[in-house]
């Protein structure tokens, strides 16, 4: 039975040209995290494998940086970066947990962070 929950940074906003940290945290389970995949809609951004470390998709290497931790830093944001991002935790023995973050990239300087929320 999957008992864990994914806590994410929730709905967030950031300024065009700036950077943002996408973070997820898996709690309430003793399952071992073997890999975390980061996706933007259906596109792979990065993989963090427990044994092999990071693989950043070549399509995003110039503006995606690994970390902190299992998170991902998006740089040089454009309005086209607005949308859904998913952290996909592969665990043993539980299986797969998925967290969702919605990022809005704003033209103005009034980018405020949304509250944290949980996905069971």
């Amino acid at each position: 039975m999957m008992t864990g929950t994914i806590e994410t940074t929730g709905n967030i906003s950031a300024e065009k040209g700036g950077s943002i940290i996408l973070q997820c945290h898996l709690s309430s389970t003793t399952a071992q995290v073997t890999q975390v995949n980061w996706e933007q809609q259906d596109q792979l951004l990065a993989i963090c494998n427990a044994d092999l470390g990071w693989h950043i998709s070549p399509s995003f290497k110039d503006r995606v940086a690994p970390g902190p931790g299992l998170g991902l830093t998006l740089q040089s944001l454009t309005v086209n970066d607005t949308g859904e991002y998913f952290c996909i935790y592969h665990t043993y023995p539980d299986g797969t947990y998925t967290g969702r973050i919605f990022l809005e990239v704003l033209e103005s300087s009034v980018a405020e962070h949304g509250a944290r929320f949980q996905i069971p």
């Epitope: 995949n37 792979l44 993989i47 494998n49 092999l52 990071w54 693989h55 070549p58 399509s59 290497k61």
Partner: antibody, heavy 118, light 107 residues
Framework: QIQLQQSGAELVRPGTSVKMSCKAV????????INWVKQRPGHGFEWIGD????????NYNEKFKGKATLTADTSSSTAYMQLSSLTSEDSAIYYC???????????WGQGTSVTVSS | DIVMTQSQKFMSTSVGDRVSITCKAS??????VVWYQQKPGQSPKALIF???NRHTGVPDRFTGSGSGTDFTLTISNVQSEDLADYFC?????????FGGGTKLEIK
């Protein structure tokens, strides 16, 4: 010992298709990307695309979209590449090579020779 | 696409010599460059990854250097078994692209 074992040479007719295989031995198949590369004498190496069996992510070189189809079977640790509508330009040696992050294409298969001839 | 240019198609050297093979990228690829050796009738073997890191089991006479657009593979104390083609690969961006290769001939 890490090995990528590729299927044998193929002699095929123009206009037909061919499907070749690449069996991974000695490492966790789902952890690494499988790249496919074409080598033709006088033309050097061309990257066709890659597939990540651990998530079925696939990337193609635009030049080979519609020509190559990449698949993987995790139960047998085997990757496949199908080439369609074959012409003489497709006569080449095709290699599979594993990769991940900094270790881009670190181990290669022995190659599959494809000859397209009527 | 990023073009990887190896301007020397052939290089001739003698056993014990030092030889440098160069590769130039058409745009900045940071250090995402791999060097390979391919002997006749064999598949490529990785020598250097991330421009300057030797792959497992590669003799220390092979060294790689460079970043950005200019990369060099140096073979010091060349041995007869080093007779092969050498080529570079960039994996900074899709599509991955290869240099045309440099054939090392032993005098």
């Amino acid at each position: 010992q890490i090995q990528l074992q590729q299927s044998g040479a193929e002699l095929v007719r123009p206009g037909t298709s061919v499907k070749m295989s690449c069996k991974a031995v000695g490492y966790t198949f789902t952890n690494y990307w499988i790249n496919w590369v074409k080598q033709r004498p006088g033309h050097g190496f061309e990257w066709i695309g890659d597939i990540y069996p651990g998530g079925y992510y696939i990337n193609y070189n635009e030049k080979f979209k519609g020509k190559a189809t990449l698949t993987a079977d995790t139960s047998s640790s085997t990757a496949y590449m199908q080439l369609s509508s074959l012409t003489s330009e497709d006569s080449a040696i095709y290699y599979c090579a594993r990769g991940y992050g900094s270790y881009a294409m670190d181990y290669w298969g022995q190659g599959t020779s494809v000859t397209v001839s009527s | 696409d990023i073009v990887m240019t190896q301007s020397q198609k052939f290089m001739s050297t003698s056993v014990g010599d030092r030889v440098s093979i160069t590769c130039k990228a058409s745009q900045n690829v940071r250090t995402d460059v791999v060097w390979y050796q391919q002997k006749p009738g064999q598949s490529p073997k990785a020598l250097i990854f991330l421009a300057s890191n030797r792959h497992t089991g590669v003799p220390d006479r092979f060294t790689g250097s460079g970043s950005g657009t200019d990369f060099t593979l140096t073979i010091s104390n060349v041995q007869s078994e080093d007779l092969a083609d050498y080529f570079c690969l960039q994996h900074w961006n899709y599509p991955y692209t290869f240099g045309g290769g440099t054939k090392l001939e032993i005098k």
